[in-house]
């Protein structure tokens, strides 16, 4: 199986280069002082929000790092290498025919991209085919200051589309999240994430599935029918990532869909899901921007209750509080609502049954000049005892056929003050969104509303 | 089911305005879709001539676009084209069609519901 | 604009027959390719969307394929009710432009 030779640390190699891989060679993305980088891992694990300008939240709330100042001190650590998945790219207003004071941020993200070339550290992106943004620029301009672009044609490979957001930064630091490139997710639309700092072990282990995407993006590419050593990982759901993150003892591990673009030892996203969601014991509080119990873009649709009949199980067979907040803004398929009431109708308290479901509506207000915007698209999911922070949304497509990725945390709730552990903190994250104005339950949520806030 | 049917006059005359309806059955068109009117010439040419959006927006084909406009009426639930300074060459048959699913990250667009069409002829 | 060009205007061919309809663009449009069908009564239906897949309904006689600037759609095992007009459409860019359409008869 030909595959063009990965890139180091310091210098991905241009498309026209291909080269073999020895099965079993050393992956040749690690740098060679890798070793030494790990034994002086410090790894800390920072969660980032993006919340949509004119959405005001109660004095006091909880809140995570504001993913735009994120990206940017980021892009600030920086000294080798930035490797960028994301589905697809659109920083500036014009991309999208729009003229709006809340496109700066992505619009400076995108010349911090450009003078980050200008200081001669390489930068690779993988992006989907197909896209959202074909009008957009962005791609062509960092191209043609030396960045590396790839279109990764998952259409034709698996007839999905590359869905993941994460970053791998020097191979030390990682973004991974909900967020795509699109300057919407810094101001209009409503994001979670997490960045994880100082990190080599764990940033080393998602760049591999950022190379299965690199190696899938070269003209004429295959899909293996057995990855070659060098993309395995060594950490998964049965031996996670072991380590102290500011000094609490925390397992960690990435998960990667489709199965199609999971070697050897990667768990599979659904798989993480569903061990999360069976561990749980008191509660599982989701936040998903769709959910699904079907097929989304196959004609006609397939019935597919996994992840439904999952979270009816831990709430009917185990007793686990189960709630689930669902985005809901102007470009929701109203086709879902029958589904989110069918889940919310097994709920009986009387039997120890409890399941919420709530959908959650960014106010549009003065916005109304930007499409696809003011929705919640976060994908995570926590419970007492892990978090789980994804780029999928809940239908069978992002598990099956469309390229995505995972991170399950568990931090022991020991020496360390109550309230910081990882889980804890999204749970208030959720807990916040949950009790806001903007959670709206089914019952006031009638049908031809369209998820148009009522103020 | 979702149903568009055009209306209106059959004929009209050169450097007069064309104004045509769509109505729209079993949807809402607020909802997730651009409004499309094409149109076919004589000898099956298609001509996409543009849109509006669910949100009111619009969008032409630059050929036609200081002639062109599409407008709604929500309450109705009907679309119109109107296309000034007619000549003999915009004698087609036109139809109302709707594109999309315009839903969050979903990135295979077409036309899934035509219209039968109304033939309009340009002449004096 | 993208020109999309059908060079066969129309075509012949029995029942039974494996028929295919070429459809080039004048430049890559990464099979953001739509495929209809126009009755002779003048009904348009969508038949497939980005290059190969199939709407609902549509008979799985109908198949779609290609990359690039070249597409061609496929019927597999003629019928009767397949006479019409074929018209392919990129959806890349705006504006949207069609092919010229194919006629495909029954001898």
């Known amino acids: 199986w030909q595959v063009p030779r990965p890139p180091t640390w310091g210098q991905v190699q241009p498309k026209d280069v291909p080269r073999s891989w020895e099965h079993g060679s050393s992956p040749a993305w690690e740098p060679l002082e890798a070793e030494a980088r790990q034994q002086r891992d410090s790894c800390q694990l920072v969660l980032v929000e993006s919340i949509p300008q004119d959405l005001p939240s109660a004095a006091g709330s909880p809140s995570a790092q504001p993913l735009g100042q994120a990206w940017l001190q980021l892009l600030d650590t920086a000294q080798e290498s930035v490797h960028v998945a994301s589905y697809y790219w659109s920083l500036t207003g014009p991309d999208i025919g729009v003229n709006d004071s809340s496109s700066q941020l992505g619009e400076a993200l995108l010349q911090k991209l450009q003078q980050l070339l200008g200081r001669n550290i390489s930068l690779a992106v993988a992006t989907s085919s197909p896209t959202l943004a074909r009008t957009s620029t962005d791609l062509q301009v960092l191209a043609a200051r030396g960045a590396h672009v790839r279109q990764v044609p998952m259409g034709r490979l698996t007839r999905g589309v590359l869905h993941s957001k994460f970053w791998v930064v020097d191979g030390r630091h990682i973004y991974m999240g909900s967020a795509n490139m699109d300057w919407r997710s810094l101001t209009q639309v409503k994001e979670l994430g997490a960045v994880i700092y100082n990190c080599s072990h764990l940033a080393q282990d998602l760049e591999k599935t950022f190379q299965t995407y690199w190696v899938l993006g070269v003209p004429k590419a295959v899909l293996p029918k057995t990855w070659p050593q060098n993309f395995s990982s060594h950490f998964n759901r049965f031996q996670p990532f072991h380590g102290l993150f500011d000094g609490v003892p925390t397992t960690a591990y990435f998960s990667a869909s489709p199965p199609a673009l999971c070697p050897q030892g990667r768990t599979r996203d659904l798989e993480a899901l569903l061990a999360v969601m069976g561990s749980a014991q008191e509660f599982i509080y989701a936040s998903v921007m769709e959910y699904f119990p079907t097929t989304r873009f196959s004609h006609p649709p397939r019935y597919w209750p996994v992840l439904d009949n999952a979270l009816r199980a831990a709430a009917f067979g185990k007793g686990v509080r189960v709630r689930l907040l669902v985005g809901c803004g102007l470009n929701t398929d109203p086709t879902m609502f029958p589904y989110l009431r069918s889940l919310q109708a097994l709920s009986n308290p009387a039997a120890n049954v409890s399941v919420d479901v709530k959908v959650f509506i960014v106010p549009v207000g003065n916005h109304s000049n930007i499409p696809f915007s003011r929705v919640n698209h976060s994908k995570f999911m926590v419970t007492e005892k892990a978090a789980y922070i994804g780029t999928s949304n809940w239908s069978e497509d992002y598990f099956s056929s469309t390229a995505g990725v995972g991170l399950v945390v568990t931090q022991s709730p020991g020496a360390q003050p109550a309230g910081a552990t990882v889980q804890e903190q999204l749970r208030q994250l959720f807990e916040r969104d949950w009790s806001s104005r903007y959670a709206v339950g089914l019952d006031g949520q009638a049908p031809g509303q369209d998820c148009v806030w009522q103020g | 089911d979702v149903q568009l049917q055009e209306s209106g006059p059959g004929l009209v005359k050169p450097s007069q305005s064309l104004s045509l309806t769509c109505s729209v059955t079993?949807?809402?068109?607020?909802?997730?879709y651009y409004w499309t009117w094409i149109r076919q010439f004589p000898g099956n040419k298609l001509e996409w001539m543009?849109?509006?959006?669910?949100?009111?927006?619009?969008n032409y084909n630059p050929s036609l676009k200081n002639r062109i406009s599409i407008t709604r009426d929500t309450s109705k639930n009907q679309f119109f084209l109107k296309l000034n300074s007619v000549t003999t060459e915009d004698t087609a048959t036109y139809n109302c069609?709707?594109?999309?699913?315009?839903?969050?990250?979903?990135?295979?667009?077409?036309?899934?519901?035509w219209g039968a069409g109304t033939t309009v002829t340009v002449s004096s | 604009d993208i020109q999309m060009t059908q060079t066969t205007s129309s075509l012949s061919a029995s029942l039974g027959d494996r028929v295919t309809i070429s459809c080039r663009a004048s430049q890559d449009i990464d099979n953001y390719l739509n495929w209809y069908q126009q009755k002779p009564d003048g009904t348009v239906k969508l038949l497939i969307y980005y290059t190969s897949r199939l709407h609902s309904g549509v008979p799985s006689r109908f198949s779609g394929s290609g990359s690039g600037t070249d597409y061609s759609l496929t019927i597999s095992n003629l019928e009767q009710e397949d006479v019409a007009t074929y018209f392919c459409q990129q959806f890349n860019t705006l504006p949207r432009t069609f092919g010229g359409g194919t006629k495909l008869e029954i001898k």
């Open positions: 543009g849109y509006i959006s669910y949100d009111g927006s619009n």
């Open positions: 079993g949807y809402s068109i607020t909802s997730h």
């Open positions: 069609a709707r594109e999309g699913p315009l839903y969050y990250g979903n990135p295979y667009w077409y036309f899934d519901v």
